[in-house]
Amino acid sequence: APVRSLNCTLRDSQQKSLVMSGPYELKALHLQGQDMEQQVVFSMSFVQGEESNDKIPVALGLKEKNLYLSCVLKDDKPTLQLESVDPKNYPKKKMEKRFVFNKIEINNKLEFESAQFPNWYISTSQAENMPVFLGGTKGGQDITDFTMQFVSS
């Protein structure tokens, strides 16, 4: 089936926005005013995954770029990366597992759990201007809660 997608931005629970930091990395920092235009717009695609009544599988691509967030092992550690794909073949309903995140809504906040690495989440640091990463702890220092803002196509 044709994959259903929507455009959105994400902010962590401290209201930090996500921006590009070099060609293959995202970082989180507080933005205001015109600087808000720097934040990345995601194309969130609703894909096949191990869907449950409270987890919705999604893929997170960067709008109008052939880059997707993916989860891979690097030095034996689950790691978040931006991966380049062939735009002729993506997005698709049946994404490879490394591209899939379980979107979990709790108290109007969103978590994004890696399908490839259960209990690892898209995370930001408390500190400003630090990379967005895949974290294996919830409720600790690192931030795993996000809000989503819809962006018109």
Epitope: A1, Q48, E50, N53, K97, V100
Partner: antibody
Framework: EVQLVESGGGLVQPGGSLRLSCAVS????????VSWIRQAPGKGLEWLGL???????YYNSPLKSRLTISKDNSKSTVYLQMNSLRAEDTAVYYC????????????????WGQGTLVTVSS | DTQVTQSPSSLSASVGDRVTITCITS??????MNWYQQKPGKPPKLLIS???TLRPGVPSRFSSSGSGTDFTFTISSLQPEDFATYYC?????????FGQGTKLEIK
């Protein structure tokens, strides 16, 4: 060889509950999802829900409030608990293995058990 | 939820006949249609999985075609053991949904 064997069926009073078991062999429950499906006498197939390898569950909306699917990986067994039974829940209950092939066929079901008959009657 | 409409609900045919069953879905499911055969007192048996893929060990007289919303299942030359009930199942999205079934009887 993949096998699924259901048990626990029988006669249940209206308003009662049932707990069915599905013992599996030939595959690992931590790697594959398992669905439950039922078939009322002389009727078609109705998908009830599933439990994934990681333990997450998805229930079909009309029955969501009355169903619980769980599993014990160490016993290679999946369970279906159903409450507040009524006459229309009389059916053969099947468990089936999900294909769980990421990026290809995640939701299809390939192997089925023989089924266990549940009769709801006073 | 994706609704699946299967037709006909019953069908009388003779050995050697060519038989066709149709399933139409309420949403585009790409090629994610599966076809099962069920005999009385037995569980359904998967004949054709998504992508019109014949399962190992299933005779080549069984075939399917279609994508999107319109799907067809064909038995090219009916054999005595083919008289059974056939179901389609969409596996594109949850909840999984079956067609109502087609009972294939001897004419």
């Amino acid at each position: 060889e993949v096998q699924l064997v259901e048990s626990g069926g029988g006669l249940v009073q209206p308003g009662g509950s049932l707990r069915l078991s599905c013992a599996v062999s030939g595959f690992t429950l931590s790697d594959y999802g398992v669905s439950w499906i039922r078939q009322a006498p002389g009727k078609g197939l109705e998908w009830l829900g599933l439990i994934w390898g990681g333990g997450d569950t998805y229930y079909n909306s009309p029955l969501k409030s009355r169903l619980t699917i769980s599993k014990d990986n160490s016993k290679s067994t999946v369970y279906l608990q159903m409450n507040s039974l009524r006459a229309e829940d009389t059916a053969v209950y099947y468990c089936a293995k999900q294909r769980t092939l990421w990026g290809y066929d995640l939701y299809g079901m390939d192997y089925w058990g023989q089924g266990t008959l549940v009769t709801v009657s006073s | 939820d994706t609704q699946v409409t299967q037709s006909p609900s019953s069908l009388s045919a003779s050995v050697g006949d060519r038989v066709t069953i149709t399933c139409i879905t309420s949403t585009d499911i790409d090629v994610d249609m599966n076809w099962y055969q069920q005999k009385p007192g037995k569980p359904p048996k998967l004949l054709i999985s998504q992508g019109n893929t014949l399962r190992p060990g299933v005779p080549s007289r069984f075939s399917s075609s279609g994508s999107g919303t319109d799907f067809t299942f064909t038995i090219s030359s009916l054999q005595p053991e083919d008289f059974a009930t056939y179901y389609c199942l969409q596996s594109d999205n949850l909840p999984l949904t079956f067609g109502q079934g087609t009972k294939l009887e001897i004419k």
